[in-house]
Interface confidence: low
């Protein structure tokens, strides 16, 4: 089609080498069509996935995407040739920086219903440079927590190392929804709640003397508890003695809770006690089966091929650490009569 | 289908606390935010506040010091308490389920509500 | 907190009338709006949220446009069962707000 009536957009994306980032566009199709084609999904308001459901009819979305080629070539389906971009309805995520991201995008809408939907489209030209500032070394980061309850903020990093005389109007997204009164390059939180968690983007506009663009940021934020006073508690087992059958195989899972910590290293670890001697065993790896705001719990099994005389002397024991402490279990294994 | 039924006394003595429960039926009450709005007679909509299923609250700065929304998980209720009461507080109250719509944008809906209670202050 | 104004407060109107209801927020709300349809005796049913997109099940004879501080709700062939009190609501800042209604009446 003949994207020369599309309405056009520059934006800029300057990435830190030293951290991971993702970078989104944004469909931006002219009212009130835009309406019409990304059909809203119904969800609750804690149900966020990492990439929303596509929903309506066997159409992956309701737009299309396409990737302009420098050489000329025809448009390029975005879908077919990218693996890195995500589309998620009428937005585009770049999962991973890189100049080669550079380019020119365009989206329309996929039905064309009506013949001025022909020229409803958008063209969206990326540019796309690392991070060259060496004295910005405390940009605000890609990743920013705000600690539940208390008062906190979140920082637009691409405006973060700028001097107080360079200070632009920021226009900022919430999960591509546009937050009206937030003007600065710092939104402040009063109180910090759950739904305050998302994608933000943060925009501002740059010009020289030739043409204006875009400058945009993406921060996922993290709403947290506060980082646990506790050491990890062991929920499973709780005997100290266990029942077997002699030659059978047994498995024996230690299931402990850990408190949040937003630096977390678990250790949980199975090791056997005999006598005066005691060793790690090798175990399958430990996996996390619920995972809350304020908690997490992880299992980790042992797997005895059969139990034998000798494991009845034996001690099992359960390890669990954070940074806080450690606890442990044992359990005596005793023959089923 | 979810459905969502307001109960409690229908009249309140001025000074007394009002209390209403809302019982979810048809549906999990958690992962949503859970709304009163109050109808004077005759008159418009009021928004008193919200409770999450992990109790976070967010009430009305004209009502905050008289209002407390609490959440029972377990019994799949939540409730309302109007302290020091006076007439002007009689009203039809509803409960409602606050839903986020997603796009890649996010849009807040009040999507189900219960058919309202009447409550009247009078000795 | 952010004011709605709704005009007119009430209207008479035929069956088959075009009827077009506006909102006004003292302040931007950006698209955060919502418009709900509320009948003698029953609750509030959601039409239309985000301004302009229709709550499923809601007849195509209702749109909402409108973004920042004007809205609009339009019906555009009134039926028998649109007689009723309808409300803007915002949904940009706490506290949510309501607009006072709009109370459509049979001519």
């Known amino acids: 089609f003949n994207i020369s009536g599309c309405s056009t957009k520059k934006l800029l994306w300057t990435y830190s080498t030293r951290s991971e980032e993702e970078f989104v566009l944004f469909c931006d199709l002219p009212e009130p069509q835009k309406s019409h084609f990304c059909h809203r999904n119904r969800l609750s308001p804690k149900q966020v996935p990492e990439h929303l459901p596509f929903m309506g009819s066997n159409d992956l979305s309701d737009v299309q995407w396409y990737q302009q080629p420098s050489n000329g070539d025809p448009l390029e389906d975005i879908r077919k040739s990218y693996p890195h971009i995500i589309q998620d309805k009428c937005t585009l995520h770049f999962l991973t920086p890189g100049v080669n991201n550079s380019g020119s995008y365009i989206c329309r809408p996929k039905m064309i219903k009506s013949p001025y939907d022909v020229a409803c489209c958008v063209k969206m030209i990326l540019e796309v440079k690392p991070q060259t500032n060496a004295s910005c070394e405390y940009s605000a980061s890609h990743k920013q927590d705000l600690l539940l309850g208390s008062t906190g903020s979140i920082s637009c990093p691409s405006l973060s190392c700028q001097s107080d005389a360079q200070s632009p109007a920021v226009t900022w997204y919430k999960n591509g929804k546009l937050l009206s009164v937030e003007r600065s390059n710092r939104i402040v939180v009063d109180e910090v709640y759950d739904y305050h968690q998302g994608t933000y983007v943060c925009d501002y506009t740059q010009s020289d003397t030739v043409s204006s663009w875009t400058v945009r940021a993406v921060v996922q934020v993290r709403t947290i508890v506060g980082d646990t006073k506790l050491k990890p508690d062991i929920l499973d087992p709780v005997e100290d003695t266990l029942e077997v059958e002699l030659g059978k195989p047994l498995t024996i899972s230690c299931k402990a809770r850990f408190g949040f910590e937003r630096v977390f290293n678990p250790v949980i670890k199975w090791y056997i006690k005999d006598s005066d001697l005691e060793w790690e065993v090798s175990v399958p790896e430990a996996k996390s089966i619920k995972s809350t705001l304020k908690d997490e719990i992880i299992e980790r099994n042992i797997i005895l091929e059969k139990v034998t005389q000798r494991d009845l002397r034996r001690k099992f024991v359960c390890f669990v650490q954070n940074s806080i402490g450690n606890t442990t279990q044992s359990v005596q294994l005793k023959e089923k009569r | 289908q979810v459905q969502l039924q307001e109960s409690g006394p229908g009249l309140v003595k001025p000074s007394e606390t009002l209390s209403l429960t809302c019982t979810v039926s048809?549906?999990?009450?958690?992962?949503?935010?859970w709304t009163w709005i109050r109808q004077p007679p005759g008159k418009g909509l009021e928004w008193i506040g919200y409770?999450?299923?992990?109790?976070?609250?967010n009430y009305n700065p004209s009502l905050k010091s008289r209002v407390t929304i609490s959440v029972d998980t377990s019994k799949n209720q939540f409730s309302l308490k109007l302290s020091s009461v006076t007439a002007a507080d009689t009203a039809v109250y509803y409960c409602?389920?606050?839903?986020?719509?997603?796009?890649?944008?996010?849009?807040?809906?009040?999507?189900?509500w219960g058919q309202g209670t009447t409550v009247t202050v009078s000795s | 907190a952010i004011q709605l104004t709704q005009s007119p407060s009430s209207l008479s109107a035929s069956v088959g009338d075009r009827v077009t209801i506006t909102c006004r927020a003292s302040q931007g709300i950006s698209s955060a709006l919502a418009w709900y349809q509320q009948k003698p005796g029953k609750a509030p049913k959601l039409l239309i949220y985000d301004a302009s997109n229709w709550e499923s099940g809601v007849p195509s004879r209702f749109s909402g446009s409108g973004s920042g501080t004007d809205f609009t709700l339009t019906i555009s062939s009134l039926q028998p069962e649109d007689f009723a009190t309808y409300y803007c609501?915002?949904?940009?800042?706490?506290?949510?707000?309501f607009g006072q209604g709009t109370k459509v009446e049979i001519k």
């Open positions: 609501q915002q949904f940009n800042s706490y506290p949510w707000t």
């Open positions: 409602a389920r606050e839903t986020i719509v997603v796009r890649g944008f996010y849009f807040y809906v009040m999507d189900v």
């Open positions: 409770i999450s299923d992990s109790g976070s609250t």
């Open positions: 048809g549906g999990s009450i958690s992962n949503y935010y």
